[in-house]
Interface confidence: low
């Protein structure tokens, strides 16, 4: 049977001569040389050798434990002369002893952590880890403990873990926000001798709302013209917070002062800065100056640093309102003249009136604006404002003038107003009455005496003020001796009658009769219409059968007073 | 900018009519009057009439009653006077001018069109 | 219609010098009249509006008053550029009229 123990090797062997690892040796060895040591497996040959007749095994290179551990062989022992084995082939190790040749090194080169400033001590920050490769079943090669190098009194380390806490109170962010810690990490349980390796912590102290708003002056003072619109900035403030990012987010509101209704403060989110702007229109005239109290604070506060003070501040800012030249001021937001409409050519039709609001009450002058009046059927006395006709007027053809006055101040024509004028031209009776169409009736050849054959209506292009009363005659001409008679129904209408019994269309087809229409206005218009009688053969109904043929041509005209 | 643009010149025979151009650019074209003016060698100015773009409404200065007419094509932006029956005494450098709409004071001239009757 | 009448039709004046020219309306038109100035071959260019207002980047030596009637333009120290002839226009009513115009020449 085979004797050998378990062979055990030192690595990183660094003597001269090959290491020698041990014998293989069979009982069956007489020591005369006929048997012959054959060595197989990890390594044989190469890194093992073996003297085939003594059976000494030697290792011909340095080995590296942490490389290879473990080597696992094969050994036979042959009879040279009959070349089979004197031995069953067994497997065999070779182990490799561990040596304190590794340092402990650190999962990463540099670690980066962060941790809130103002945290309690003991606070965890980051847990650093480093191995070794040496053995850590045998000895305390592998053995690790954690210590803080640099970065005392800031930090600390747990020994065993790597746990790196915050070792001091109160640390401000905005006092100092960066630092490097350097952790050390030693085997052989920290005792003398052992190997070391370090690693780099940058810490960052994160923010927390530990400072309030502060504004860097206690008094604003801004100017701003009293034509600024509501909405106009005048003027920007603003405070300061040693925080960053939303800890540092400021809000401002206007508290107190007698502006408070006058202005209002926008935050401009992106410059944190407060934006006092118009609110109400000013008034030079009536206020001269405004204080407002303006407050900053964080819209966001921790309540554990509330005992530091209230997380806002506030300044004073004064608004001086600044004098501007504004335009003139009608007396009226606007004029309704009225002229009649048989006004002459510079006729007065009225006038307006504007002043200067300013404390300087600069003189104005008065101009029509043309777009409104392009036909310049108006005028305007620059000085005094009085408006009169530069054309005739015909209130038919247009009854409202809606013009557009200017007044502009003489020492500054940039300042200018506007006013409407609404001018009404008022009725005169300059339009004669008419017939409301054109009137071609008939009447039949057996017509008896007074028979209505036709009602007149009349139009008149006047609008008197009473109401139109038309009056309806014959033509004097054709009074006398007319075979028909006007009837004047006092209600603006006229029936024509037949005066006669019978009409004789052979004797005569038509008739014309001129009538003449009044109106009952200062000065009394009237016209003449004339109205076309066709005398028709009619059946016992009275309907029409036969007319002279010129009567066919208005067959309206013809079906009216059947 | 507003520009009134107008021939440089016109050369007619006696007796005959010749249409002069003004084409309006930079404003709106019906907003505003356009005026007529006269002015003979060595002479001074002579107001002829005006028209409005919007409607065609003119007034003219008696003297030129019979001798011009005004008229407008809004779709090209053009006023245009047509002088009738010329002689020699209708030789000048016609103006077109637009008025200013507040004050009404001729702001903007054309470069004139010089129109000479000659046989 | 209103008649303007311009004195004087012709002055000779030199550099420096100051000069007034007037216009006299037919009937009052409210200050309702311009000067401009023309020089040989060019368009006519508007001095003053409204009597008295200096149209946009007229010199300060101009200037014009009056009023109902009565209208007149001073030169104060008069330049080389000055010279020409100078009209003035009524804008009161419905039909316009110049004035017959003053040549400035240099003496």
């Known amino acids: 049977s085979w004797m050998w123990n378990q062979f055990f090797l030192l690595e990183e062997y660094t003597g001269s001569d090959y290491q020698y690892v041990g014998k293989l040796h069979s009982d069956q060895d007489r020591g005369d040389g006929s048997l012959k040591y054959i060595l197989s497996g990890d390594g044989a040959g190469d890194l093992f050798i073996i003297n085939e007749n003594t059976g000494d095994i030697q290792a011909t290179k340095r080995l590296d434990r942490e490389e290879k551990p473990v080597y696992i062989l094969r050994a036979q022992a042959i009879n040279r002369r009959t070349g089979r084995p004197v031995e069953p082939e067994s497997e065999f190790i070779i182990k490799i002893h561990d040596i304190n040749d590794n340092e402990p090194i650190f999962t990463k080169e540099v670690y980066t952590a962060t941790v809130p400033e103002m945290s309690d001590v003991g606070t965890f920050v980051v847990q650093v880890t480093a191995t070794d490769a040496d053995d850590p079943t045998y000895g305390n090669s592998a053995k690790v403990v954690y210590s803080i190098l640099q970065g005392q009194p800031y930090f600390s380390v747990e020994s065993e873990t790597g746990i790196i806490k915050t070792a001091l109170l109160n640390m401000d962010r905005e006092n100092r926000e960066q630092y490097q810690v350097v952790i050390q990490a030693k085997d052989m349980g920290g005792q003398m001798g052992g190997l070391s390796g370090t690693t780099t912590v940058n810490i960052t102290l994160t923010d927390v709302n530990d400072n309030p708003p502060r504004f860097p002056q206690s008094t604003y003072q801004f100017k701003t013209p009293e034509s600024s619109p509501p909405g106009t900035p005048i003027g920007r403030i603003k405070a300061s917070d040693a925080d960053v990012g939303e800890n540092a987010e400021i809000e401002y509101s206007i508290t107190d002062g007698e502006g408070l209704d006058m202005f209002d403060v926008i935050t401009d989110q992106e410059t944190q800065e407060g934006i006092i702007t118009v609110k109400k229109l000013l008034d030079f005239e009536k206020k001269k100056v405004y204080t407002l109290k303006v407050e900053a604070s964080n819209p966001y506060v921790e309540p554990r640093f509330l005992y530091l003070g209230p997380f806002k501040d506030s300044a004073t800012v004064r608004i001086v309102v600044e004098d501007v030249d504004e335009p003139p001021v009608f007396s009226k937001l606007a004029y309704i003249l009225q002229i009649r409409e048989d006004a002459q050519i510079n006729t007065t039709i009225g006038s307006v009136t504007a002043q200067d609001p300013d404390a300087a009450r600069n003189p104005v002058k008065y101009s029509v604006d043309r777009h409104t009046d392009m036909d310049r059927i108006f005028n305007i006395d620059s000085g005094n404002g009085s408006i009169f006709t530069s054309k005739l007027l015909d209130r038919e053809t247009l009854l409202w003038h809606n013009i557009t006055v200017i007044a502009t101040e003489i020492n500054n024509p940039k300042q200018s107003s506007r006013v409407p004028l609404y001018i009404k031209v008022l009725d005169v009776n300059d339009n004669a009455p008419e017939f409301a169409e054109f009137y071609e009736t008939f009447v039949c050849e057996k017509a008896k005496a007074d028979q209505l054959i036709q009602t007149l209506h009349a139009v008149d292009k006047d609008d008197p003020y009473s109401g139109h009363q038309f009056s309806f005659s014959l033509a004097p001409e054709a009074a006398s001796g007319s075979n028909f008679t006007i009837q004047d129904n006092k209600d603006n209408t006229a029936g024509i009658l037949t005066r006669k019994n019978g009409y004789n269309r052979h004797e005569m087809s038509t008739y014309l009769l001129p009538v003449v229409i009044s109106d009952n206005d200062y000065p009394v218009q009237s016209s003449t219409g004339t109205v076309t009688v066709r005398v028709c053969a009619c059946d016992h109904h009275g309907n029409m059968q036969s007319c002279h043929a010129e009567a066919l041509i208005h067959p309206t005209g013809l079906s009216t007073g059947a | 900018q507003v520009q009134l643009q107008q021939p440089g010149a016109e050369l007619v025979k006696p007796g005959a009519s010749v249409k002069l151009s003004c084409k309006a650019s930079?404003?709106?074209?019906?907003?505003?009057?356009i005026h007529w003016v006269k002015q003979r060698p060595g002479q001074g100015l002579e107001w002829i009439g005006e028209?409005?773009?919007?409607?065609?409404?003119?007034n003219c200065n008696e003297n030129f009653k019979s001798k011009a007419t005004l008229t407008v094509d809004k779709s090209s932006s053009t006023a245009y006077m047509q002088l009738s029956s010329l002689t020699s005494e209708d030789s000048a450098v016609y103006y077109c001018t637009i008025p200013n709409l507040l004050w009404w004071y001729f702001d903007v001239w054309g470069a004139g069109t010089t129109v000479t009757v000659s046989s | 219609d209103i008649q303007m009448t311009q004195s004087p039709a012709s002055l000779s004046v030199s550099v420096g010098e100051t000069v007034t020219i007037t216009c006299r309306a037919s009937e009052n038109i409210y200050s309702n009249l311009a000067w401009y100035q023309q020089k040989q071959g060019k368009s006519p260019q508007l001095l003053v509006y409204?009597?008295?207002n200096l149209a946009d980047g007229v010199p300060s030596r101009f200037s014009g008053s009056g009023s109902g009637t009565q209208y007149s333009l001073k030169i104060n120290s008069l330049q080389s550029e000055d010279f020409g002839s100078y009209y003035c226009?009524?804008?009161?009513?419905?039909?316009?009229?110049f004035g017959g115009g003053t040549k400035l020449e240099i003496k």
């Open positions: 930079g404003y709106t074209f019906t907003s505003y009057w």
């Open positions: 409204e009597a008295t």
């Open positions: 226009q009524h804008f009161w009513g419905t039909l316009w009229t």
């Open positions: 028209i409005n773009p919007s409607n065609g409404v003119t």
